[in-house]
């Protein structure tokens, strides 16, 4: 990526890392308002299976692994990108490496959920406090999950689907920070590992993923009031290990793997019309990206 002048800060969709033939170090940002892509400062170490989030206007890249011709190393790293300076800086590492991790943010704290280290599938969860640059373990999930989708709604952390080392999962669970405990919620209609999970309009959406046989294009959403999952319109492309985020009331899904191809496709979901549309293409196909949106 370029190391030139820092871009103007706006509401951009950032995509970090990913995988195509090997783990990638790209950081790119898409501006939905004008359809342009920015090439930004590379990650210091290539990573796929990472997660991205934004706290206090800074972008964090969490976990993943570096799968390269030289070897394969799961990552415990937390790195922070400042859009004002276009620079990455390392933060305190997690207690364990976590590939195919999920993350969520509650009250400015980053929760790192599940993931794998070699053949170990974690149920452990840890919380990062940016002001102290410290990680602390919290209550473990009830289920081991890699390729887990994580979202935060009403200050509760949801872990959805994934793979426990034996089975792909349709189960989901919810973490209550005040009680430091997890509780199962209604299972999805569909087994999904490597799905994209996000929150829009008081619902948790689970898009795509892999059911142990095939990549999926189906999408379902969980209504916390009725505690039910309902299908919405499917994506145009089947995809697992995709990136997902919400920007101005719409869901964006980025890349992923369709069983044959590493996708460059970016689709956008409009909840008002219950439709998906192709909005742009990434500069190259990839799976396992970390995605987040800058705050205004």
């Amino acid at each position: 990526g370029s190391m030139g002048h820092a871009p103007k800060v706006g509401r951009l969709i950032y995509t970090a890392g990913g995988y195509f033939r090997q783990s990638l170090s790209y950081l790119e940002a898409y501006n939905p308002s004008d359809g342009t892509w920015l090439d930004l400062a590379d990650l210091q170490v290539p990573r796929s299976g990472l997660a991205g989030c934004v706290v206090g206007g800074l972008l964090y890249a969490v976990g993943g692994r570096n799968n390269s011709p030289d070897g394969n190393t799961d990552s415990s790293a937390l790195d922070c990108y400042n859009p004002m300076t276009n620079q990455w800086s390392p933060c305190a590492p997690m207690s364990v490496p976590r590939n195919r991790i999920g993350v969520g943010v509650i009250d400015g704290h980053i929760y790192a959920v599940g993931g794998s280290h070699g053949c170990i599938h974690h149920n452990s969860v840890e919380r990062y406090e940016p002001e102290r640059d410290e990680w602390h373990l919290v209550a473990p999930m009830l289920t081991r999950r890699i390729g887990v989708g994580v979202a935060v709604l009403n200050r509760l952390l949801y872990a959805v689907g994934g793979f426990d080392g034996t089975n792909r999962l349709n189960s989901a669970e919810c973490y209550y920070p005040e009680r430091n405990e997890w509780r199962m919620i209604t299972a999805m209609n569909t087994i999904r590992s490597g799905a994209g999970v996000c929150v829009l309009h008081n619902c948790i959406y689970a898009a795509g993923g892999y059911d142990g046989q095939d990549q999926l294009n189906s999408v379902e959403r969980y209504d916390v009031e009725t505690e039910t999952w309902t299908f919405v319109a499917p994506m145009k492309h089947r995809r697992s290990a995709l990136g997902i985020t919400v920007h101005q009331g719409r869901i964006y899904v980025l890349g992923g793997y369709d069983g044959h191809t590493f996708l460059d496709s970016v689709e956008c979901y409009d909840p008002d019309t219950d439709t998906w549309s192709e909005v742009t293409r990434m500069t190259s196909g990839r799976s396992g990206v970390g995605v987040a949106v800058t705050m205004e």
Partner: antibody, heavy 120, light 107 residues
């Protein structure tokens, strides 16, 4: 009945290329990790490469990284191992196997193997 | 890379004998060890996974155990069809590695 049948082996000169095929029946290769393992004459087993059906990620032994490429064509239910820049030390029987997951133990649905001989 | 040191490299035994084969990992591999049987000209067959779990269809005379970084395959009563070469494999971390094999021959 679950079966894997390897083909494509043969005699090749150093520096040459071969593409091995692994045709699966009785299960969908999209539902399993696929691994290649090799065995040099009179020697032990060596893991070579794996492909993850969920993410598309691949892993390679350092001895073959950059020279070999594992892939899968789900429409043909067949996995492949493209071998370039072959060396004498690549001479072996090559087996493909179905795995429960990317790092997992190989199942016993291994084929009978295909012999690759690299010699001038 | 994690080394899997297998012993003995060969052994002679009679039908009905109890046979024990050991693999020692050079570092912790948790319980991510599998055992295979291979007969001449054939592909290896999975016997044991996760150190002690019997793979489906494998006779119960085969068992596996773990003590720290030491892993053991036991055949409680050797049968004629058990004369073969046995390999251990760790899949704890990249790259997956095998032991050098133990050939079980007829005494």
């Amino acid at each position: 009945e679950v079966q894997l049948v390897e083909s494509g082996g043969g005699l090749v000169q150093p520096g040459g290329s071969l593409r091995l095929s692994c045709a699966a029946s009785g299960f969908a290769i999209s539902a399993s990790s696929i691994h290649w393992v090799r065995q040099a004459p009179g020697k032990g087993l060596e893991w070579v490469a794996s492909i993850d059906p969920e993410t598309g990620e691949t892993l390679y032994a350092k001895s073959v990284a950059g020279r070999f490429t594992i892939s899968a064509d789900t429409s043909k239910n067949t996995a492949y191992l493209q071998m370039n820049s072959l060396r004498a030390e690549d001479t072996a029987v090559y087996y493909c196997a179905r795995g429960e997951w990317f790092y997992g133990a190989l199942s016993d649905y291994a084929g009978q193997g295909t012999l690759v001989t690299v010699s001038s | 890379d994690i080394q899997m040191t297998q012993s003995p490299s060969s052994l002679s035994a009679s039908v009905g004998d109890r046979v024990t084969i050991t693999c020692r990992a050079s570092q912790s591999v948790s319980s991510a060890v599998a055992w295979y049987q291979q007969k001449p000209g054939k592909a290896p067959k999975l016997l044991i996974y996760s150190a002690s779990s019997l793979y489906s269809g494998v006779p119960s005379r085969f068992s596996g155990s773990r003590s720290g970084t030491d892993f053991t395959l036991t055949i409680s009563s050797l049968q004629p069809e058990d004369f073969a070469t046995y390999y251990c494999q760790q899949s704890y971390s990249f790259p997956s590695t095998f032991g050098q094999g133990t050939k079980v021959e007829i005494k």
